[in-house]
């Protein structure tokens, strides 16, 4: 089975760890695919190690473990993320995470501070 946090949030400009945990008494993991909606983020293979899709190579760092660290988040990164575990002989298992990217607290506080700052 796949165990994951179904909903996570992070700040714009920050980073987030995407993590799925697979447990089985019999099946061994051969490959893990990570996708943003339908777009490939990265793949881990027991044989080949990690490959980060060129589109995300400047923002996605493999790990920790079989998860991903997604950096320099933008509001457009809000959405569904999927981990797909290819196992042998168990087959394929999928997990889903919904990531909400929020406006950074600096931006929110900065606007408030600017509005209340004393003149002169």
């Amino acid at each position: 089975t796949i165990d994951t946090k179904r909903n996570i949030s992070a700040e714009e400009g920050g980073s987030v760890i995407l993590q799925c945990h697979f447990s089985s008494d019999t099946a061994e993991v051969t490959q893990v695919d990570w996708k943003q909606q339908d777009q490939l983020l990265a793949i881990y293979s027991v044989d080949l190690g990690w490959h980060v899709a060129s589109v995300f190579s400047d923002r996605v760092v493999p790990g920790p473990s079989l998860g991903l660290t997604f950096q320099s988040l933008t509001m457009n990164d809000t959405g569904e993320y999927f981990c797909t575990y290819h196992t042998y002989p168990g087959g394929i298992y999928k997990g889903r995470i919904f990531l909400k990217v929020q406006e950074s607290s600096d931006d929110r506080n900065g606007l408030a501070q600017f509005q209340t700052a004393p003149l002169g």
Epitope: K35, L40, S45, L48, Y88
Partner: antibody, heavy 118, light 107 residues
Framework: EVQLLESGGGLVQPGGSLRLSCAAS????????MSWVRQAPGKGLEWVAS????????SYADSVKGRFTISRDNSKNTLYLQMNSLRAEDTAVYYC???????????WGQGTLVTVSS | DIQMTQSPSSLSASVGDRVTITCRAS??????LNWYQQKPGKAPKLLIY???SLQSGVPSRFSGSGSGTDFTLTISSLQPEDFATYYC?????????FGGGTKVEIK
């Protein structure tokens, strides 16, 4: 430098057999899934067979199932395609290709021509 | 089996033109879509993998987009060496299937 070199093609009569080889170098052969793809003269690309690295799982196109056998010898860094009961419609250039992550074919050999004719 | 339909089957264009080739799958294939270039007498060459990722060493004028069933290969400014035949290929499930090809010719 990654290199894939096919050999074993030639002229064979209908019903005959051939064994194609693909010698790999420049990468860890045993870590990669591999495929055979063919191209009939003046036609498009047609996948023939694949063999996975991690599980050894083998898949064939319906058009060759029961007649062709894909195999690999990791100690020799070589991929094979045993072709039996050959038909005129098997005439094509046969390419071997490396398939990282069972996803895309990133390196191809130069191809070897198989002609089935009486 | 998943059918891959490419259009157009051929096109004529001039150096510097923006060229768009489309590929449609008979069912959803997520982003399991790759694009190859083939020149006469040569082996295919990988251009784009996973629908939108540029293969190492491929010029940035090539780009891919799409997901599900509809995909596009774009050449932003056609160069003399780009005249070739282009194929899409799905790796979502076996049998792996290719589109029929798009031949890009000189106008």
């Amino acid at each position: 430098e990654v290199q894939l070199l096919e050999s074993g093609g030639g002229l064979v009569q209908p019903g005959g057999s051939l064994r194609l080889s693909c010698a790999a170098s420049g990468f860890t052969f045993s870590s990669y899934s591999m495929s055979w793809v063919r191209q009939a003269p003046g036609k498009g690309l047609e996948w023939v067979a694949s063999i996975k690295s991690s599980t050894g799982t083998i898949s064939y196109a319906d058009s060759v199932k029961g007649r062709f056998t894909i195999s690999r010898d990791n100690s020799k860094n070589t991929l094979y395609l045993q072709m039996n009961s050959l038909r005129a419609e098997d005439t094509a250039v046969y390419y071997c290709a490396r398939v990282p992550y069972d996803y895309w074919m990133d390196y191809w050999g130069q191809g070897t021509l198989v002609t089935v004719s009486s | 089996d998943i059918q891959m339909t490419q259009s157009p089957s051929s096109l004529s264009a001039s150096v510097g033109d923006r060229v768009t080739i489309t590929c449609r799958a008979s069912q959803s294939i997520s982003s399991y879509l790759n694009w190859y270039q083939q020149k006469p007498g040569k082996a295919p060459k990988l251009l784009i993998y996973a629908a939108s990722s540029l293969q190492s060493g491929v010029p940035s004028r090539f780009s891919g987009s799409g997901s599900g069933t509809d995909f596009t290969l774009t050449i932003s400014s056609l160069q003399p060496e780009d005249f070739a035949t282009y194929y899409c290929q799905q790796s979502y499930s076996t049998p792996l299937t290719f589109g029929g090809g798009t031949k890009v010719e000189i106008k």
